[in-house]
Amino acid sequence: KFSKQSWGLENEALIVRCPRQGKPSYTVDWYYSQTNKSIPTQERNRVFASGQLLKFLPAEVADSGIYTCIVRSPTFNRTGYANVTIYKKQSDCNVPDYLMYSTVSGSEKNSKIYCPTIDLYNWTAPLEWFKNCQALQGSRYRAHKSFLVIDNVMTEDAGDYTCKFIHNENGANYSVTATRSFTVKDEQGFSLFPVIGAPAQNEIKEVEIGKNANLTCSACFGKGTQFLAAVLWQLNGTKITDFGEPRIQQEEGQNQSFSNGLACLDMVLRIADVKEEDLLLQYDCLALNLHGLRRHTVRLSRKN
C-alpha cells in the first residue's frame, strides 16, 4: 500500500519522497532495505536523507534498490518503501517506456504539460522543454512556472515532451530531466462564467476548537478542458501563501472532476488545530477564468 516506484538517470539528481507521509514535525529515518544500514543525513554524502526526502546527488546505477523509510509518528513507527531504479543515459534520442511519466492529454483550449516530480526539487525558472529531443522554439511554446503551454494545439503536437531543469543543493547544481507523452484530443467545449458549487455564499461552517477542519472550494467553468481556470482560497483578502499561518494550507494541486460533462475544480483548505482566532477570519473561495472572477465567503463558528 505504501510502496512507490521512482526512477532517474545516472549523473542526474533524483529526489524521492517517503510514500508514508507524516506531519512535518515527525522524524523520518531512511535505510537500505537489503542491508538495513541507515542512510546518513549529512549533506556531504552523495546519497543522504533529509526528512521525508531521500536525495541522490547525483544518482548512480548502483543506487538502484529498495529503500525503507520509517516515519516516527506517535503510537506507531510507520513504514514505507521506495523502489528506486537508476538507468544509464541513452545514447540515442528515444526515451524508453520505463522512463516515461504518465501521459497527459490536451486540446485546442487547454494544452498544459506539467513537468513531472519538479515539486520535489529546488529549481529556478525557466524550464527547458524538448519534444522528441528537439529544443522547443517559437512563439507557440511558453514555459510557464512548472508547465509548458502550447498555443493553437494541433494533432502534430502529440509526442514525447522532456523538461530539463537544474536542482540546486548548497550551491551545487545538478541536472534533472523528466519525460511524458502528450496526446491531443479533438474536443468541442465551451467556457462560462465560474459557478461555485461549494461553499454557499456567506456559509457558516461549524468547527471544533483544537481539531482539524477542511473547507472545500468547488467550482465549474464550462464543458471540456478549460484553458485557464483556477480555484483558490484567500484569508482576509490575502493569498494563503502570503498570510503566513503554517496551520492553514491549501491542498497542493487542484483536483479536476467532470460533473455532468462540466469541467470543475476543487481546492481544499486544511486548518490544523483550529484556534479561537481562526473564527475571526474571513475565508474567501475564489473561482476565476477568462470570463471573470466569482467569490463566496465563509466564516467559522464554534460547534456547541
Partner: antibody
Framework: EVQLVESGGGLVQPGGSLRLSCAAS????????MHWIRQAPGKNLEWVSA???????YYPGSVKGRFTISREDAKNSLYLQMNSLRAGDTAVYYC????????????????WGQGTTVTVSS | DIVMTQSPLSLPVTPGEPASISCRSS???????????LDWYLQKPGQSPQLLIY???NRASGVPDRFTGSGSGTDFTLKISRVEAEDVGVYYC????????FGGGTKVEIK
C-alpha cells in the same frame, strides 16, 4: 452512531484457537488505526494488538507469533485470530478505535466495543 | 517498553469534594509534534472503558468540565473538581507515544 460490536468469544481448551470479529459502523473505518485491548477478570487493561490503515501490524511480546490481527476495509471489519491459547489469555477482549492514520490526528482511544469474553480452560 | 505507574490504588471520595489521581511514565511522553501522548479513561462497573482526556489535557466530547487533565514530561494528573456519584469506577492513564501502555488503575469509590 459510531459503533464497534465484537463477536466470536467463547470457551476454548488450552492450545486451541478462536477468531474474534469486530463490526464497525458510523465512521470511515479504512482511515483509522484499530486496536484489540483485553482485560482479565479483576485485572487491568492490556493492549493486545493493533493494525494501521496500511495493514501494518503490531503486537506485544506476550502474544507475538500466536495472535494475528487483520482488517477488511470493504466490510468495515476487524479480526483477531488467536492460536495456541493459554489460560492467561482468558479475558474480555475489546475492539477499539485509535487515531486517524490518514491525517495523523489523535483524539485518544475514543470508541470501544462492548467486549467479547474469551475463556481458556480445560 | 514505557511503564505507567498510577497512584493511589484506591481513592475513597465524598460527593461534592475534589479528587486527584497521579500518573507517572518511565520516560517523557512528549512527541516531536509538541503533544504529550497521555490519555485518561474511566471504566464504570460492568461497562467498557470510556475516554475522558486525550493528549494530556483535552477533554473528550461530552465529558463534563469538572474533569481536568494536566502535566508534562513524565508526570500527569487527573483532577475532579467536585465528585459526583456517577464518577465511581476505575480510572486508567494510558500512554500512546509508543504503542499503548495502561497504568495499574485507581479505584474511585464513595466513602
Amino acid at each position: 452512531e459510531v459503533q464497534l460490536v465484537e463477536s466470536g468469544g467463547g470457551l476454548v481448551q488450552p492450545g486451541g484457537s478462536l477468531r474474534l470479529s469486530c463490526a464497525a459502523s458510523g465512521f470511515t473505518f479504512s482511515t483509522y488505526d484499530m486496536h484489540w485491548i483485553r482485560q482479565a477478570p479483576g485485572k487491568n487493561l492490556e493492549w493486545v494488538s493493533a493494525i494501521d490503515l496500511a495493514g501494518d501490524t503490531y503486537y506485544p511480546g506476550s502474544v507475538k507469533g500466536r495472535f494475528t490481527i487483520s482488517r477488511e476495509d470493504a466490510k468495515n471489519s476487524l479480526y483477531l485470530q488467536m492460536n495456541s491459547l493459554r489460560a492467561g489469555d482468558t479475558a474480555v477482549y475489546y475492539c477499539a478505535r485509535g487515531g486517524d492514520g490518514y491525517n495523523y490526528d489523535y483524539y485518544g482511544i475514543d470508541v470501544w466495543g462492548q467486549g467479547t469474553t474469551v475463556t481458556v480452560s480445560s | 517498553d514505557i511503564v505507567m505507574t498510577q497512584s493511589p490504588l484506591s481513592l475513597p471520595v465524598t460527593p461534592g469534594e475534589p479528587a486527584s489521581i497521579s500518573c507517572r511514565s518511565s520516560q517523557s511522553l512528549l512527541h516531536s509534534d509538541g503533544y504529550h501522548y497521555l490519555d485518561w479513561y474511566l471504566q464504570k462497573p460492568g461497562q467498557s472503558p470510556q475516554l475522558l482526556i486525550y493528549l494530556g489535557s483535552n477533554r473528550a466530547s461530552g465529558v463534563p468540565d469538572r474533569f481536568t487533565g494536566s502535566g508534562s514530561g513524565t508526570d500527569f494528573t487527573l483532577k475532579i473538581s467536585r465528585v459526583e456519584a456517577e464518577d465511581v469506577g476505575v480510572y486508567y492513564c494510558m500512554q500512546a507515544l509508543q504503542i499503548l501502555t495502561f497504568g495499574g488503575g485507581t479505584k474511585v469509590e464513595i466513602k
